[in-house]
């Protein structure tokens, strides 16, 4: 999906209002310095591409993020403010359902959510030069 035509300011507002709080809740008990940010993004469409990938695509050691509260709200925000997004997800979700594992919070998931927090922070500061 090409995130170029999304309403970035409304997605940002939804993130600041509630999605960010859900990410913090998920990470509660974890030190903010515990994980290094290894995933980066260069502009808002790129950030949303990385956010969508880390949130909804199962990875080795962390197959369960798509059912978390922050993921549900992320999906809602992208569907509401990115034209045509929800229609593009139909085939992707059917494939994911077959691979979905039992919901377990692993250290790998915590690391992945830490990366997500970094991507979201970068999304909110689009004018900063890439580190």
């Amino acid at each position: 999906y090409d995130f170029t035509n999304c309403d970035f300011e409304k997605i940002k507002a939804a993130y600041l209002s509630t999605i960010s709080k859900d990410l913090i809740t998920y990470m509660s008990g974890t030190k903010s310095t515990e994980f290094n940010n290894t995933v980066s993004c260069s502009n808002r469409p790129h950030c949303l591409t990385e956010i969508q990938s880390l949130t909804f695509n199962p990875t080795a050691g962390c197959a369960s993020l798509a059912k978390e509260m922050f993921a549900m709200k992320t999906k809602a925000a992208l569907a509401i403010w990115c034209p045509g997004y929800s229609e593009t997800q139909i085939n992707a979700t059917q494939a994911m359902k077959k691979r979905r594992k039992r919901k377990v919070t692993t250290n790998k998931c915590l690391e992945q959510v830490s990366q997500l927090q970094g991507l979201w922070r970068r999304f909110n500061r689009p004018l900063l030069k890439q580190q």
Partner: antibody
């Protein structure tokens, strides 16, 4: 304007199943999660689960132990909630409720259907 | 499962008086994930307050919400006849989503 119109009242025997529909209009149906909430006579509200019409993704309340199934028909902008193995305690008003971001970007159930009364009686 | 406990179950108030409704949450949640709904007999619930303190569209300013962590409050500064109803708090912090048992505000 956003409207959620539910199917009519149902009377069912214990052990049977019921399927309630909720037809949406006035917004992009595929883009908003739809919840089902029930209310037994004189009681409070109980969340049953939700479905994302865009891809059929669902999240259910474990209290219903596999008895509830939510589906959607994008061609008619309708979501369905089927509850099986009915018992008398399932007698309730069943509501569909869209969830979305309000003007302050808080996420909540912003529009509700009119409710469908389901009576389970032998 | 997060348990929401509302008190009192019934609040008897005279028109013009102040009403304070409480919602206690079994584990701490973000204030952005606590909402209030109003329901009148024979009607569907209506969104009333979003994110602890933000009034839904068209809700009069005599209503206010406050709180954080595990304790939240809905206050009606001067009750009007149309305010008599049941009010439910609800959390959107974790699954399953849960509601409080409701507080019925009735005419004294």
């Amino acid at each position: 304007q956003v409207q959620l119109v539910q199917s009519g009242a149902e009377v069912k025997k214990p052990g049977a199943s019921v399927k309630v529909s909720c037809k949406s209009s006035g917004y992009a149906f595929s883009s908003y999660w739809m919840n089902w909430v029930r209310q037994a006579p004189g009681q409070g509200l109980e969340w049953m689960g939700q479905i994302f019409p865009g891809d059929g993704d669902t999240t259910y309340n474990g209290n219903f132990k596999g008895r509830v199934t939510m589906t959607r028909d994008t061609s008619t902008s309708t979501v369905y909630m089927e509850l099986s193995s009915l018992r008398s305690e399932d007698t309730a008003v069943y509501y569909c409720a869209r969830s979305g971001f309000d003007y302050g970007y808080f996420y909540a159930m912003d529009y509700w259907g009119q409710g469908t009364t389901v009576t389970v009686s032998s | 499962e997060i348990v929401m406990t509302q008190s009192p179950a019934t609040l008897s108030v005279s028109p013009g008086e102040r009403a304070t409704l409480s919602c206690s949450v079994s584990s701490s949640i973000s204030s952005s994930n606590l909402h209030w709904y109003q329901q009148k007999p024979g009607q569907s619930p209506r969104p009333w307050i979003f994110g602890t303190s933000n009034l839904a569209s068209g809700i009069p300013a005599r209503f206010s919400g406050s709180g954080s962590g595990t304790e939240f409050t809905l206050t009606i500064s001067s009750l009007q006849s149309e305010d008599f109803a049941v009010y439910y708090c609800q959390q959107w912090s974790s699954y399953p989503l849960t509601f409080g048992g409701g507080t019925k505000v009735e005419i004294k």
